[in-house]
């Protein structure tokens, strides 16, 4: 069982337990911050990020941000707390096992973002319309 002095941790956001006292392990996410990308006009892309990290806090999820402007294309992969906005946007899809890109309005660039909560799920980013959340099959996957 979990030692009592671990549960009485000062920094309680680092420890999340269920009713049986089991401690939640953080998400495993691709974490390369911002890198140049060749991902363009594809249904899905791999992140080409070789770094998988244990997220710092148990509540964090995996996030990917794809940006295109006149100069370049970048892909950002990070861990982030879904209770907090990222790039001024709420992570609406944090419970999804897949990282399904949704376009966000940003002046001067094309901006897509996704979030998800399965191992290294931000390694495979999906742009295809067939994965739109209006698809009942996807909702089944997400909420199973």
């Amino acid at each position: 069982t979990i030692p009592p002095h671990v549960q009485k941790s000062v920094n309680n956001d680092m420890i999340v337990t269920d009713n049986n006292g089991a401690v939640k392990f953080p998400q495993l996410c691709k974490f390369c911050d911002v890198r140049f990308s060749t991902c363009d006009n594809q249904k899905s892309c791999m992140s080409n990020c070789s770094i998988t990290s244990i997220c710092e806090k148990p509540q964090e999820v995996c996030v990917a941000v794809w940006r295109k402007n006149d100069e370049n294309i970048t892909l950002e992969t990070v861990c982030h707390d879904p209770k907090l906005p990222y790039h001024d946007f709420i992570l609406e899809d944090a419970a999804s096992p897949k990282c399904i890109m949704k376009e966000k309005k940003k002046p001067g660039e094309t901006f897509f973002m996704c979030s998800c909560s399965s191992d290294e799920c931000n390694d495979n980013i999906i742009f295809s319309e067939e994965y739109n959340t209006s698809n009942p099959d996807l909702l089944l996957v997400i909420f199973q």
């Epitope: 269920d18 089991a22 401690v23 939640k24 392990f25 199973q144």
Partner: nanobody, 124 residues
Framework: EVQLLESGGGLVQPGGSLRLSCAAS????????MAWARQAPGKGLEWVSL????????YYADSVKGRFTISRDNSKNTLYLQMNSLRAEDTAVYYC?????????????????WGQGTLVTVSS
């Protein structure tokens, strides 16, 4: 009864090395992911490293990447943490922990059994 017993902690100078061991009993060791976590004095729990049941996949926190190596010997029911290039901020009680369920896939990892910990002090 599940038991996890850590050993190998102690006092080491900055830049030094230590190898922690965790002897497991009371469950089928090779079926379960195992992890190391640590708690520095007055701080929260920090997950350090995770290893898959068969030992082929390993993961690390950014703070220890490139310095720590997790491994396991399933024939000896033992988990290891090799710690190199130790820093003062690595000072903590180190715990090994067992994943609650053996299943993989889209399920939240939860760890239900913990050792009592071994103290690592990095100081000159």
């Amino acid at each position: 009864e599940v038991q996890l017993l850590e050993s190998g902690g102690g006092l080491v100078q900055p830049g030094g090395s230590l190898r922690l061991s965790c002897a497991a009993s009371g469950f089928t060791f090779f079926n379960y992911e195992m992890a190391w976590a640590r708690q520095a004095p007055g701080k929260g729990l920090e997950w350090v490293s995770l290893i898959s049941a068969e030992g082929t996949r390993t993961y690390y926190a950014d703070s220890v990447k490139g310095r720590f190596t997790i491994s396991r010997d399933n024939s000896k029911n033992t988990l290891y943490l090799q710690m190199n290039s130790l820093r003062a901020e690595d000072t903590a009680v180190y715990y090994c922990a067992k994943r609650r369920d053996a299943s993989m896939g889209h399920t939240t990892r939860r760890f239900d059994y913990w050792g009592q910990g071994t103290l690592v002090t990095v100081s000159s």
